[in-house]
């Protein structure tokens, strides 16, 4: 028999300094998780401790914080360098700079293979990237050698920038051939390494012949066996056995997300490359684990640059922006109109003839928005300003819900009106008109949405069944500010970008900004 | 590290006044409600006021309406609360505490108020 | 005003048992609800908001539960720091507390 160690991260999304226990801003260091530098301190310890040991991204290490909005994905490559990372899967983030974003800061800088199968270049595109991914690699381990196969969510052209010469084929029928050729290769010990979320990690370990572990990202799935270390909940235990569809136990593993665990998987292979067994944990990375010093010292060299971006001029305004609580907990406030407007603008995806976008709707509670930004300063808007208005370190997600959902987020929004709470909701691409002296929950007097399937934009009635795309925070996905429906009914959630780097780099693009208060919310009483 | 401190309490007369102060720091002050809450010896907790993160919205417990004013000034991560007719009922250890927001919440460590003649 | 009442006033336990202690609002809060612990001359501590998400840092024997006007607060196995008060708090609007557990060693 033979062992194999695979230390694995996912959805790291730009968190090389340590955070707190909620993956946000680290504020009190005694008590502070993860970081590059915590990181490589556990995966030294490991490294020295066993003999094959093989260290895996699943993708997603780009956007999240300010050092993606400042590095632009060099950060990622130096210091996965560093860490001596043996292979890494493209996640759908990766592509946020467009393909040029990809290339230039990290697959040219990488030492590290990065890979994905179901990912085709096309046109002037396939000479380019050529040999810069590749699908699949045989690494050695020991005296052996493994094969790592690559994926990545073929819903990525809706989620982030891979522009129109490259083809996201379906993850199954992409990796078998891939597999097939590692076989006939003589690999007898194949990982499957990807970013489609445990679903598809799932499909893949039951439908693909061949794949004997399975390592996954972007759905942040949390697995562990006994008693989690954390607040995190487990969604299985880990790992997560699939049994194939030819009768294999296939072992599925994720590390929840941000850097905050190192996932932690032994497995025992015979002399055929059959899993003879399987398990571990994720690690948690807390402060029991000191920072490897000559990391840290490295992280706080390249921190210098981020504390001068904060300060920069980002653009202007001319108008006021409102973003006091008495409008956006009360009433359409024009920096809710903004943000937004800037979270339609960075989901513009042009996927389709028959649509102008794949998404139209954006709502945002007001208790989200923290601060207004005066004009009267030279118009200048920094991020530190934007770090103001939204402090909290959330994402702008997309997720698909039901009209009838949305109906019912719009009478929450408004079902305990006046006391200046936070579930108030902001919005675009939306008009809602609401009547107060109604009961709660029957106060949404009109509803229309603006059209996505039309070559002209318009405002047509909600329709109860229809099932719709809307950017949101992260924070309302999962039932903040009392929105429990739609973390109930979503049928489907993607997280998104850094909640500042999309107002940022939509205020970059303008240059000067001017929203109005413009009839989106309206309140009426009496007969429609 | 986030940390409020609170500071004013003392003794006063029946009927008199007392400022209280909260000094914020290691965190964006400006961002966050601010609420005070007070427990009178041996008593459980009581909420007394809130006001929004720009100051333009303020709650009062109805003990304490038109008696109390709760104010902040951002420039200086400053909470503030201005008792005036006080009553031997107000005996208590007053706090401040940011609200339970996407970070959590964090309280100081309290003043006393000592209403007594 | 949305009155809070928590039920025991105290209760004695042991370390390793499981206590259940219960808040009634007077009318519904849908879920604004939170749960503190306090010990003697400190502050109070938040360890869960919004009836059932455990806070940052807040160990997992404490869980939450319950929506609209009941609402529970369990401790699965007690720690030797459990034991000190615990309030229930009301958000929904202006806030209020319950009257508090004193939770006490048996």
């Known amino acids: 028999a033979w062992e194999l160690t695979i230390l694995h991260t996912n959805d790291v999304h730009s968190r090389l300094e340590q955070t707190s226990e909620d993956s946000s801003k680290c504020v009190n260091a005694s008590r502070c998780m993860g970081g590059v530098a915590r990181l490589f301190t556990k995966v030294q310890q490991i490294r020295r401790a066993e003999p094959n040991v093989l260290l895996l991204d699943a993708g997603d290490q780009y956007q999240g914080t300010i050092w993606f909005t400042v590095y632009k994905g060099a950060e990622v490559a130096h210091f996965m360098n560093a860490l001596r990372y043996d292979a890494m899967a493209l996640g759908n983030h990766e592509f946020d700079n467009g393909v040029e974003g990809l290339i230039e800061p990290l697959l040219k800088e990488a030492k590290f293979p990065i890979l994905s199968a179901n990912i085709k270049a096309k046109g002037p595109l396939a000479s380019q990237i050529s040999g810069l991914y590749l699908p699949y690699k045989v690494l050695p381990v020991g005296d052996e050698v493994v094969g790592i196969v690559g994926y990545t969510s073929k819903e990525t052209p809706f989620l982030s920038n891979p522009g129109t010469n490259l083809v996201f084929e379906d993850e199954i029928t992409a990796l078998q051939p891939e597999v097939d050729k590692l076989k006939t290769l003589n690999v007898n010990k194949i990982i499957a390494l990807g970013h489609s979320g445990f679903e598809m990690d799932k499909l893949i370990a039951q439908k693909v012949r061949g794949v004997d572990v399975v390592v996954g990202g972007h759905s942040n799935t949390f697995l562990y066996t006994g008693n989690p270390p954390s607040k995190e909940v487990p969604a299985g235990k880990y790992p997560f056995i699939v049994t194939s569809d030819d009768g294999r136990k296939v072992p599925v593993v994720q590390a929840y997300a941000f850097g905050k665990y190192l996932g932690y998987l032994k497995i025992e292979f015979d002399e055929r490359g059959n899993v003879i067994s399987s398990h571990g944990n994720p690690i948690l990375l807390n402060s029991s684990i000191p920072e490897d010093p000559s990391i840290k010292a490295d992280i706080n060299k390249w921190r210098i640059k981020l504390d001068n971006y904060s300060t920069q001029e980002l653009g202007k305004t001319i108008v006021y922006l409102d973003g006091s609580s008495q409008s956006c907990r009360f009433r359409e406030c024009n920096m809710g109109n903004l943000i937004c407007d800037a979270m339609i603008n960075n989901n513009l995806r042009h996927t389709d003839e028959m649509f102008w976008n794949h998404v139209s709707m954006c709502i945002l509670n007001g208790g989200g928005i923290r601060s207004p930004i005066d004009e009267r300063n030279n118009g200048t808007i920094t991020w530190e300003n934007l770090a103001a208005v939204l402090p909290f370190g959330g994402t702008f997600d997309l997720v698909q819900l039901k009209g009838s959902t949305l109906k019912k987020a719009f009478e929450h929004s408004v079902h305990r009106y006046g006391q200046s709470t936070g579930e108030f909701l902001q919005v675009g691409g939306i008009h809602v008109v609401y009547d107060l002296s109604r009961k709660p929950g029957d106060r949404v007097v009109k509803l229309d949405v603006l059209c996505t399937k039309c070559r002209v934009p318009s405002y047509d009635p909600l329709k109860m069944d229809e099932v719709y795309k809307v950017i949101l925070p992260n924070f309302l996905a999962n039932g903040g500010d009392g929105f429990q429906m739609i973390k109930d009914e979503l049928l489907r959630h993607d997280s998104g970008d850094q909640d500042i780097n999309v107002v940022s780099t939509y205020i970059s693009k303008m240059k000067v900004i001017y929203p109005a208060v413009e009839g989106r919310i309206k309140f009426s009483t009496g007969s429609h | 590290e986030v940390q409020l401190v609170e500071s004013g309490g003392g003794l006063v007369q029946p009927g008199g006044s007392l400022r209280l102060s909260c000094a914020a720091s290691g965190f964006t002050f400006s961002s966050y409600d601010m609420h005070w809450v007070r427990q009178a010896p041996g008593k459980g907790l009581e909420w007394v006021a809130v006001?929004?993160?720009?100051?333009?919205?303020?709650y009062y417990a109805d003990s304490v309406k038109g008696r109390f004013t709760i104010s902040r000034d951002n420039s200086k991560n400053a909470l503030y609360l201005q008792m005036n007719s006080l009553r031997a009922e107000d005996t208590a250890v007053y706090y401040c505490?940011?609200?339970?927001?996407?970070?959590?919440?964090?309280w100081g460590q309290g003043t006393l108020v000592t209403v007594s003649s | 005003a949305i009155q809070m009442t928590q039920s025991p006033s105290s209760l004695s336990a042991s370390v390793g048992d499981r206590v259940t202690i219960t808040c009634r609002a007077s009318q519904g809060i849908s879920n604004y609800l939170a749960w503190y612990q306090q010990k003697p001359g400190k502050a109070p501590k938040l360890l869960i908001y919004?009836?059932?998400t455990l806070q940052s840092g807040v160990p997992s024997r404490f869980s939450g539960s319950g929506s609209g006007t009941d609402f529970t607060l369990t401790i699965s196995s007690l720690q030797p720091e459990d034991f000190a008060t615990y309030y229930c708090q009301q958000s929904y609007s202006t806030p209020h507390f319950g009257q508090g557990t004193r939770l006490e060693i048996k």
């Open positions: 505490a940011t609200e339970i927001a996407a970070k959590g919440d964090y």
């Open positions: 006001m929004s993160y720009e100051g333009s919205n303020k």
């Open positions: 919004a009836a059932s």
